[in-house]
Amino acid sequence: MNGSEYFVKIQSFLGGAPTEDLKALSQQNVSMDLATFMKLRTDAVLPLTVAEVQKLLGPHVEGLKAEERHRPVRDWILRQRQDDLDTLGLGLQGGIPNGYLVLDLSMQEALSGTPCLLGP
């Protein structure tokens, strides 16, 4: 069974998938469609790297631009380095500026909804 066939079989169960499952899926050439991606749990999407999202979505990654103001894409963008977002070639804006240090302060982030940044 190839990645696409596997994805079709599990598609209906993906809404509640944890980050670990999404990371594993990204290694299986599944090309998740954007509608499915938009239904994923925000907290499961946030830890994914730009490279992992690119692998997870395949050609569907081109659709991120039209969804950049909507959850979970908007919140995911805020967690990524702008340099990494730029590699997607879509002009996505709102990432962490180059030269900033990201502090993973879970309590602060839970309260504000955004990561804590220390400037250069």
């Epitope: 954007l34 081109e62 631009k65 730029d86 070639g89 879509l90 002009g91």
Partner: antibody
């Protein structure tokens, strides 16, 4: 003003390869993927694939996957489409096209002027 | 891949006539369809996107409607300069597909 300027017409022999260029100006080249569409004489439009100009990652229409190579040169804001093992059925006008990402995966709002490729022995 | 079936493949109408072209998608594409006009020797020109949104500068005699799988493109009053081939494009999938085209001629 957005412009996509393509290379000139080509005449090739069967079995040869052709490389068509598309020079972009008037916008940030790395913010929009570049697509390629072809049109055989008297026929409709056929999507061939696209390329992410920022990292050079292409996605191809399955029909062309074994013969097409899409590349970019960021320094000159130019996209390239190379088609190998040419046959007479590849005689067509080849267009580059830029999408507008207003909704979903984006529709094409700017097109190159087209490059005519003739395959003949 | 999503197939786009466009009809008719050609039509002949008089100046002032109402002209209708249809595109049927092989699966639900919401409203993600665009319509293009192509004249001989020229690149396609975008007329309409998102089913019914007219591009700036495009005459109001052009319109579009539909959703899901069935879409219609209409020229309310055909003009001599409308002689061209018209194509639909689905962009609900990253692997874009076009309809087969409709050649519009004047009677």
């Amino acid at each position: 003003e957005v412009q996509l300027v393509q290379s000139g017409a080509e005449v090739k022999k069967p079995g040869a390869s052709v490389k068509v260029s598309c020079k972009a100006s008037g916008y940030t080249f790395t913010n929009y993927w570049m697509h390629w569409v072809r049109q055989a004489p008297g026929q409709g439009l056929e999507w061939m694939g696209n390329i992410n100009p920022s990292n050079g990652g292409p996605y191809y229409n399955e029909r062309f996957r074994s013969r097409v190579t899409m590349t970019v040169d960021k320094s000159t804001s130019t996209a390239y489409m190379e088609l190998s093992s040419l046959r007479s059925e590849d005689t067509a006008v080849y267009y580059c096209a830029r999408p507008y990402y207003g909704s979903s995966y984006g529709y094409f709002d700017y097109w190159g002027q087209g490059t005519t490729v003739t395959v003949s022995s | 891949d999503i197939q786009m079936t466009q009809s008719p493949s050609s039509l002949s109408a008089s100046v002032g006539d109402r002209v209708t072209i249809t595109c049927k998608a092989s699966q639900d594409i919401n409203k993600y369809i665009a319509w293009y006009q192509q004249k001989p020797g020229k690149a396609p020109k975008l007329l309409i996107h998102y089913t019914s949104e007219l591009q700036p500068g495009v005459p109001s005699r052009f319109s579009g409607s539909g959703s899901g799988t069935d879409f219609t493109f209409t020229i309310s009053s055909l003009q001599p300069e409308d002689i061209a081939t018209y194509y639909c494009l689905q962009y609900a999938n990253p692997l874009r597909t076009f309809g087969g085209g409709t050649k519009v001629e004047i009677k």
